[in-house]
Amino acid sequence: GSVKVLHEPSCFSDYISTSVCQWKMDHPTNCSAELRLSYQLDFMGSENHTCVPENREDSVCVCSMPIDDAVEADVYQLDLWAGQQLLWSGSFQPSKHVKPRTPGNLTVHPNISHTWLLMWTNPYPTENHLHSELTYMVNVSNDNDPEDFKVYNVTYMGPTLRLAASTLKSGASYSARVRAWAQTYNSTWSDWSPSTTWLNYYEPWEQHLGLNDIFEAQKIEWHEHHHHHHHH
């Protein structure tokens, strides 16, 4: 039977080492057995390279192509093949289709003045174009109350966010995740980072205490409680 593409390839680049193309076939397909995506940089002397696609769903194929450190002028010629049959041909300019890497190592630390300090890592090395271009969105949500969530836009350089404990419900468990985008490249958002979860302790009467004092008090309370049970 004839092989047809239902939704033609859509490609994004992390603008450092990888471009990913995804497309949908008109029927369930064993992508790696039946299809090949060839790609070639439009540059003198460039060789043709082949990507073996994998299945994302029954009829959805995805191909991850290693690319050299991308620059704005790079344009790739893409050809999708089923054996000797050319199913689709197009071009792809990574700088015009950027999807940043996911921010990493999201952590939450108690900070002075009743604040939580959220920190994560910029996914790009300092020498990469995108390192200084990223802005972030942080999503903070109550694990037990879907209505209780906040979205913070971090438009300054540092990958940090200070969060007043008083803005969150006391005693509630919260999760945070972060994603990135590059405004000057008109990029899409990155995938969300894995969530990190913490327990928010904040009571009005504790306002004279720093959060570190509260944590020390909690540690003592826990220790005494544990010690008490150990003796009975």
Partner: antibody
Framework: EVQLVESGGDLVKPGGSLRLSCVAS????????MDWVRQAPGKGLQWLSL????????YYADAVKGRFTISRDNAKNTLYLQMNSLRAEDTAVYYC??????????????????WGQGTLVTVSS | DIVMTQTPLSLSVSPGETASISCRSS???????????LDWYMQKPGQSPQGLIY???KRASGVSDRFSGSGSGADFTLKISRVEADDAGVYYC?????????FGQGTKLEIK
């Protein structure tokens, strides 16, 4: 040590054919593009052709397009230039040269970083 | 096609002085920041050419630091400082960005 040794230059009549060879050693031949460049007596350098490391991509100057064919045998570390329909103006010293590294996605460029000693082609009746 | 134009076509310099050769292309040779596909070659009488500078400003292996390349876009310069007798020869610029590759006409450097 990188070495490029051209051969095949000769005296040939107009309309005739000739095949030049360039044997390479001292570097991973299959990873690099190779070029042919010529120099007519008392004149400057003229680029003729480039072939990618795998041999899959070839490029030509307008002056030789359709008459000259560049090729390579990576098993023999040898570059070739097949020259047909030769003309008096093709008289020159022909050099082979090592060009960009093409095994990477974007070729890494170092200029024409090594040249052969040249072989003389004379086209005359 | 990209046309390469060198100036001057000949140059006479005393030992110890600085020689400067200009090369202009009909199109920009900048592919991206830091990637200017312009080379400089030297050819001594009766010898094969040898690479001096690639990507506009990078010295080829074994080349003296008296040779320096600069420029971007369509304007490039080769400077030879503290010129020596052994520097005599013909100097060529070449664009390596797109087919057909092309050389300048050459600049003959004579040492007084």
């Amino acid at each position: 040590e990188v070495q490029l040794v051209e051969s095949g230059g000769d005296l040939v009549k107009p309309g005739g054919s000739l095949r030049l060879s360039c044997v390479a050693s001292g570097f991973p031949f299959r990873d690099y593009a190779m070029d042919w460049v010529r120099q007519a007596p008392g004149k400057g350098l003229q680029w003729l052709s480039l072939i990618s490391g795998s041999g899959g991509k070839t490029y030509y100057a307008d002056a030789v397009k359709g008459r000259f064919t560049i090729s390579r045998d990576n098993a023999k570390n040898t570059l070739y230039l097949q020259m047909n329909s030769l003309r008096a103006e093709d008289t020159a010293v022909y050099y082979c040269a090592v060009d960009r590294l093409t095994k990477t996605i974007r070729p890494q460029y170092y200029g024409l970083w090594s040249w052969g000693q040249g072989t003389l082609v004379t086209v005359s009746s | 096609d990209i046309v390469m134009t060198q100036t001057p076509l000949s140059l006479s310099v005393s030992p110890g002085e600085t020689a400067s050769i200009s090369c202009r292309s009909s199109q920009s040779l900048t592919y991206s920041i830091g990637y200017n596909y312009l080379d400089w070659y030297m050819q001594k009488p009766g010898q094969s050419p040898q690479g001096l500078i690639y990507l506009g400003s990078k010295r080829a292996s074994g080349v003296s630091d008296r040779f320096s390349g600069s420029g971007s876009g369509a304007d490039f310069t080769l400077k030879i400082s503290r010129v020596e007798a052994d520097d005599a020869g013909v100097y060529y610029c070449m664009q390596g960005l797109q087919s057909p590759l092309g050389f300048g006409q050459g600049t003959k450097l004579e040492i007084k």
